[in-house]
């Protein structure tokens, strides 16, 4: 581990490098060669890793195919129409000692003698309860099987087995059918069988899957199902509140409050990448990008990234970048939320970037939340805060995020806290006092019931749990089309969202949030 990899001789020196030799079971005249590559070092672009592939011919001749572009996400396929002689193996040459090859396949030309004995695949249908002996359950080229021997209300399971010559495959996954009660593909949604949709086809990716499950970012209506992709259409629908940042803003679970940064300081900034852009809620339109090389195109309007240093420089200098997000109302943290616009991965690199996260309390003490892997697939990154119950609770006023790649772009940081509940204040209440969620403070205990004032919100519709405005009453406020919900507490704007609604609660004579609908 103490060896510097750049001062010892490489494992695969130029000009030839290392080679992997693979032999195939049957020599044949090839039509194509396919190679599956699963890893290429970061030092190589796609054209450098495989510097030659040689075909080993039965005649003793080695046929060089030259250098090849290889990628991890798509197999390399080389057409070999001109070879015209039997090949028994291949040699793959590389200068990359970390190159990983998963498989190689040599495909023969048409009508090769090896295939003359081959028979078409056959399929056998197996049923539980078993089919009658005289029922032809082996299908040849016709892949349709009709079962006529059924009883109403009975449960049947079917499997398909593939037959090649005398060999049989493992049975397929089973399909269960209750005769007379419908099935996935009949256009009727059988909720009792776990169906969420039924569009009468067996295609994945159209909103309703092969197994009649609704696919992510789709909504399906009617029978047979008609599915549409809703994410990003500008309409915040009930079912997408938790999933669509574009349409509904950032989802905050009930009982929690998300505060976005009200101020920020960063380690590296200039006029091209100012730190202040991470203040407030992130832009909904920003899609997280991975494997980038250049962040100059418009990212700095929505997100901060350390633009003052290049990626190669930061790696050689082992630079650490950081940002501090400050919050206007120190709270007991339940989670920290980090929104990414890029996840720090470099084009041609497999390495995922990590961030280190700390909470800073009102006494300037640091509380470590650990290292977290960044990925656009897991965006926003939600980091739960686990409190040591043997220690006093603390109010967090800032979050520090540090990382080592200048290709990390962050568009927002939020502090998630408990709505109407403050363990620090709660623990400070004296005898004769009780914690008031409305005041967020300790108040002298009083038994008289205090009603809330009438709730009046312009440009909104109200749906209240009762006509009384007693302690615990709840009203749901929904803004009319074209208006944006502004949610405040103690004159601090805590959230601005395009829809669809917010619930306010009457607590000891006060509504727990002030709500307005702004154009």
């Amino acid at each position: 581990s103490a060896v510097n990899p750049h001062t010892v001789p490489p494992a695969c020196p130029e000009p030839q490098g290392c080679y992997l030799e693979l032999e195939f079971l049957y020599p044949l005249v090839p039509e194509s060669l396919t190679i599956w590559v699963t890893f290429v070092s970061t030092d190589w672009d796609s054209s450098g890793a495989v510097n030659d592939i040689k075909l080993l011919a039965v005649s003793g001749k080695n046929i060089s195919l030259g250098p090849q572009n290889v990628f991890c996400d798509v197999p390399l396929t080389i057409r070999l129409w001109d070879v015209g002689e039997e090949v028994y193996g291949i040699q793959i040459y590389t200068l990359d000692e970390h190159l990983e090859i998963d498989a190689a396949m040599l495909t023969s030309t048409a009508d090769t003698p090896l295939c003359l004995q081959c028979k078409p695949l056959k399929y056998k249908v197996v049923r539980d309860p078993p089919l009658q002996m005289d029922v032809a359950s082996i299908l040849h080229l016709n892949r349709k099987f009709v079962d006529m021997d059924l009883n109403l209300g009975s449960v049947y399971q079917y499997w398909v087995i593939t037959i090649s010559g005398t060999e049989e495959s493992e049975p397929s996954p089973a399909v269960t059918y209750i005769h007379g009660s419908g099935y996935c593909g009949d256009g009727i949604i059988q909720k009792d069988q776990g169906e969420q949709c039924d569009d009468m086809n067996k295609i994945n990716g159209d909103g309703c899957s092969l197994f009649c499950r609704q696919e992510v970012s789709f909504n399906c209506i009617d029978e047979p199902s008609r599915c549409y992709f809703h994410d990003g259409d500008g309409v915040c629908e009930e079912f997408e509140q938790k999933t669509s940042i574009k349409d509904c803003g950032v989802y905050t679970p009930q009982g929690f409050l998300d505060q976005w940064a009200s101020n920020a300081s960063v380690s590296h900034q200039d006029q091209q990448c100012p730190g202040w852009v991470i203040i407030g809620q992130p832009a909904a339109s920003q899609v997280c990008r991975t494997k980038v090389i250049d962040l100059s195109e418009g990212i700095s309007q929505h997100a901060w990234y350390p633009c003052t240093i290049s990626y190669p420089y930061s790696q050689l200098a082992q630079t650490t970048f950081w940002l501090r997000a400050y919050f206007s109302q120190p709270m007991v943290a339940a989670a920290v939320i980090v929104h990414l616009v890029t996840d720090g991965t470099y084009y041609g690199d497999q390495k995922q970037e990590t961030i280190s996260v700390q909470l800073l309390d009102t006494k300037d003490q640091s509380h470590d939340l650990g290292l977290h892997v960044l990925s656009c697939r897991n965006n926003p990154l939600i980091i739960p805060v686990v409190h040591d119950l043997s220690q006093p609770f603390y109010h967090s006023q800032a979050v520090r995020v540090s990382f080592s790649s200048p290709l990390v772009a962050i568009s927002g940081v939020a502090l998630r806290s408990f709505d109407n509940f403050d363990p620090v204040t709660l623990s400070s209440c004296q005898r004769g006092e009780t914690y008031s969620p409305a005041e967020q403070s300790c108040v002298h205990f009083a038994c008289e019931k205090t009603d809330c004032p009438e709730l009046a919100v312009e440009n909104a519709s109200l749906n209240c749990s009762s006509s009384d405005r007693y302690h615990g009453a709840q009203c749901t406020v929904s803004c009319r089309t074209g208006y944006v919900l502004q949610i405040r507490r103690d004159d601090e704007l805590i959230k601005s969202q395009t829809g669809p609604s917010v619930t306010v609660t009457c607590t000891e004579g006060k509504w727990n949030k002030q709500v307005a609908c702004e154009p």
Epitope: N4, H6, T7, D43, Q272, I293, D294, L295, S296, E297, C307, T308, I309, S310, Y311, P312, Y313, L316, A317, Q318, Y347
Partner: antibody
Amino acid sequence: QVQLVQSGAEVKKPGASVKVSCKASGYTFTSYAMHWVRQAPGQRLEWMGWMNAGTGATKSSQKFQGRVTITRDTSASTAYMELSSLRSEDTAVYYCARGPSMETPTTFGMDVWGQGTTVTVSS
Amino acid sequence: DIQMTQSPSSVSASVGDRVTITCRASQGISRWLAWYQQKPGKAPKLLIYAASSLQSGVPSRFSGSGSGTDFTLTISSLQPEDFATYYCQQENAYPFTFGGGTKVEIK
């Protein structure tokens, strides 16, 4: 003033190795990066690799990977570039050039260059 | 590798002329581009770094601009000592690569 002084011209046979030195003065050697660049006759400049003179970490161009070794002697404020398995096409002028500060960069690019070392590879 | 393409490969100009040299990268390189001047038999000299920052001691008639893939070096009023070859170089991705050079000659 800041300067880089390189070793003298070399004539080598194919297959041999050459080691070029670059002595730094006028600045804190270990606070900066050091690049190596070469230029064949009538050709464009070609980057070979660089080193963090403080940590000794290096990165070289894949074209030279395995043939080029960049090292340093901090006590002598000297950087070295060794190129092995020489071939005729390695005939060129080899330059060392100071890169940015590895602590608090205020500039980028290669701001100070050595005078160059001519290496001739011939049988 | 990122290819750096300079144009023109040579330009003939007179003292006092405004000269513009362009450099195009085959992929985006943000602002990580430097410009160098090289005279025959001499080592290159850094003129501009980070696309537009003037290196200390370099006359203000030299200026750089651009971001992403397209960059420009401008000499606002050519002086006799400016006749040389100019190279651009990217340092956004390994390996760092240079352009083919633009020779500025006396008309």
